[in-house]
Interface confidence: medium
């Protein structure tokens, strides 16, 4: 691949002929350093840049604003890419978002959004979404009208309460809202009746904590 055209995302990686899922290095506009990401080349045509993954509870997601800003974890396992990187990537071109979910009974479901981007740090990494489809509920468990990102040390929700403190993790909380994929990881048998778990309300209800989640983005024109 020509040096002047580095990979902006996993779609570029895929289109360059790399169609195996795994870790790749991408060069995001306006970011000083390259970034290692997990590319999912299997789901729905491939080319997906994974921005969040939960699978085993090995990583602590109860972190502050700075850590959610710059990201944490490892793309080979559980991780959060970082809001600054998600903002920078989704500023490059138009993206869609796909969220893959699995419950403790082995049922899989997904939610997909035709448009996804977030604001910058000054805008509290506000969520912008359009066009929800998928099998994880008829309604969107992400706030379609948008919500600011909150963490335990940055309360930007609409609750008159501190959602991120009470539900744990950093997320686009409303009041507090029907989802939190960065909540506490609970193992099988312990995952019912948990308000602060990994929640996608319109898939499994308000207090069921999920087994695994993957959030991934891909350009609209892929």
């Amino acid at each position: 691949r020509e040096e002047e055209k580095p990979f902006r995302d996993c779609a570029d990686v895929y289109q360059a002929g790399f169609n195996k899922s795994g870790i790749y290095t991408i060069y995001i506009n306006n970011m000083p350093e390259p970034k290692k990401v997990f590319c999912n080349m299997d789901v729905n045509g491939g080319g997906w840049t994974v921005i969040q993954h939960r699978e085993d509870g090995s990583l602590d997601f109860q972190r502050g604003w700075k850590e959610y800003k710059m990201g944490f974890g490892n793309p080979s396992g559980e991780y959060w890419l970082g809001n600054e990187f998600i903002f920078a990537i989704t500023s490059q071109r138009q993206y869609m978002l796909r969220i893959e979910l699995m419950d403790w009974e082995g049922n899989r479901a997904y939610s997909q959004y035709d448009r996804f981007h977030i604001g910058n740090e000054k805008q509290n990494y506000r969520l912008y979404l359009k066009g929800h489809t998928g099998t994880a509920g008829k309604q969107s468990s992400l706030i379609l009208h948008g919500a600011d990102f909150s963490t335990k040390d940055a309360d930007n929700d609409n609750c008159m309460c501190k959602c991120a403190l009470m539900l744990t993790g950093g997320w686009w909380f409303d009041a507090c809202g029907p989802s939190n994929l960065n909540g506490m990881f609970y193992t099988a048998g312990q995952n019912h009746g948990k308000l602060n778990g990994i929640k996608w309300h319109y898939f499994k209800g308000p207090s069921y904590s999920l087994r695994s989640t993957t959030m991934m983005i891909r350009p609209l024109d892929f």
């Epitope: 379609l144 009208h145 609409n158 609750c159 409303d174 308000l195 308000p206 207090s207």
Partner: antibody, heavy 120, light 111 residues
Framework: QVQLVQSGAEVKKPGSSVKVSCKAS????????ISWVRQAPGQGLEWMGR????????NYAQKFQGRVTITADESTSTAYMELSSLRSEDTAVYYC?????????????WGQGTLVTVSS | NFMLTQPHSVSESPGKTVIIPCTRS????????VQWYQKRPGSAPSIVIY?????PSGVPDRFSGSIDSSSNSASLTISGLKTEDEADYYC?????????FGGGTKLTVLG
């Protein structure tokens, strides 16, 4: 299906206090916010405040701050709204209400209402 | 805090369509979900629209909700009006300072 049953009508003197109860059944009481809303004769709906029983956290509308206290007893799945320093303008039907989606600030389920009359 | 403004009353004949607007005074109407409640005399309010346009089960599809960012307002549309639709209708939204209701609109079904 959540059901909310409120205590009966009250007649109170100006300056006194009233405490209205709201017993919930058929849902997870502790994890759902219980709001209190009132409607004075000929007036619209007015939100007074709410409590999240599992957290014991109550929030109040600015208008009622200092005069209203909302509490909850998880053991009996009952929420309470106490309004003090009553005046004639507080004559209203008082409703408790909750959402099927915990904490969200909209109201799917309502109690039958409690008429509070403030009169000397 | 913001205010939600509704017309005091609207009236229409059975079978017709009526639109009840609800205008937000400050902040974007799209920044928080809007709900609509029906309130009949002597009864508790009941939700007819939530999350801008979602209809709870049991509410007829004659009821629909929408948001218009250009006028910073939400609307409740009731088509195929029936006499039993006669009631007060309230819009409601919220922000980090609490819950706000509109002043209510009295819907009269003529005839």
């Amino acid at each position: 299906q959540v059901q909310l049953v409120q205590s009966g009508a009250e007649v109170k003197k100006p300056g006194s206090s009233v405490k209205v109860s709201c017993k919930a059944s058929g849902g997870t009481f502790s994890s759902h916010a219980i709001s209190w809303v009132r409607q004075a004769p000929g007036q619209g709906l007015e939100w007074m405040g709410r409590i999240i029983p599992i957290l014991g956290i109550a929030n109040y509308a600015q208008k009622f701050q200092g005069r209203v206290t909302i509490t909850a007893d998880e053991s009996t799945s009952t929420a309470y709204m106490e309004l003090s320093s009553l005046r004639s303008e507080d004559t209203a039907v008082y409703y408790c209400a909750t959402s099927r989606l915990e904490w969200l600030l909209y109201l799917d389920y309502w109690g039958q209402g409690t008429l509070v009359t403030v009169s000397s | 805090n913001f205010m939600l403004t509704q017309p005091h009353s609207v009236s229409e004949s059975p079978g017709k369509t009526v639109i009840i607007p609800c205008t937000r005074s400050s902040g974007s109407i799209a920044s928080n979900y809007v709900q609509w409640y029906q309130k009949r005399p002597g009864s508790a309010p009941s939700i007819v629209i939530y999350e801008d346009k979602q209809r709870p089960s049991g509410v007829p599809d004659r009821f629909s909700g929408s948001i218009d960012s250009s006028s910073n307002s939400a609307s409740l549309t009731i088509s195929g009006l029936k006499t039993e639709d006669e009631a007060d209708y309230y819009c409601q939204s919220y922000n980090s300072r609490g819950v706000m209701f509109g002043g209510g609109t009295k819907l009269t079904v003529l005839g």
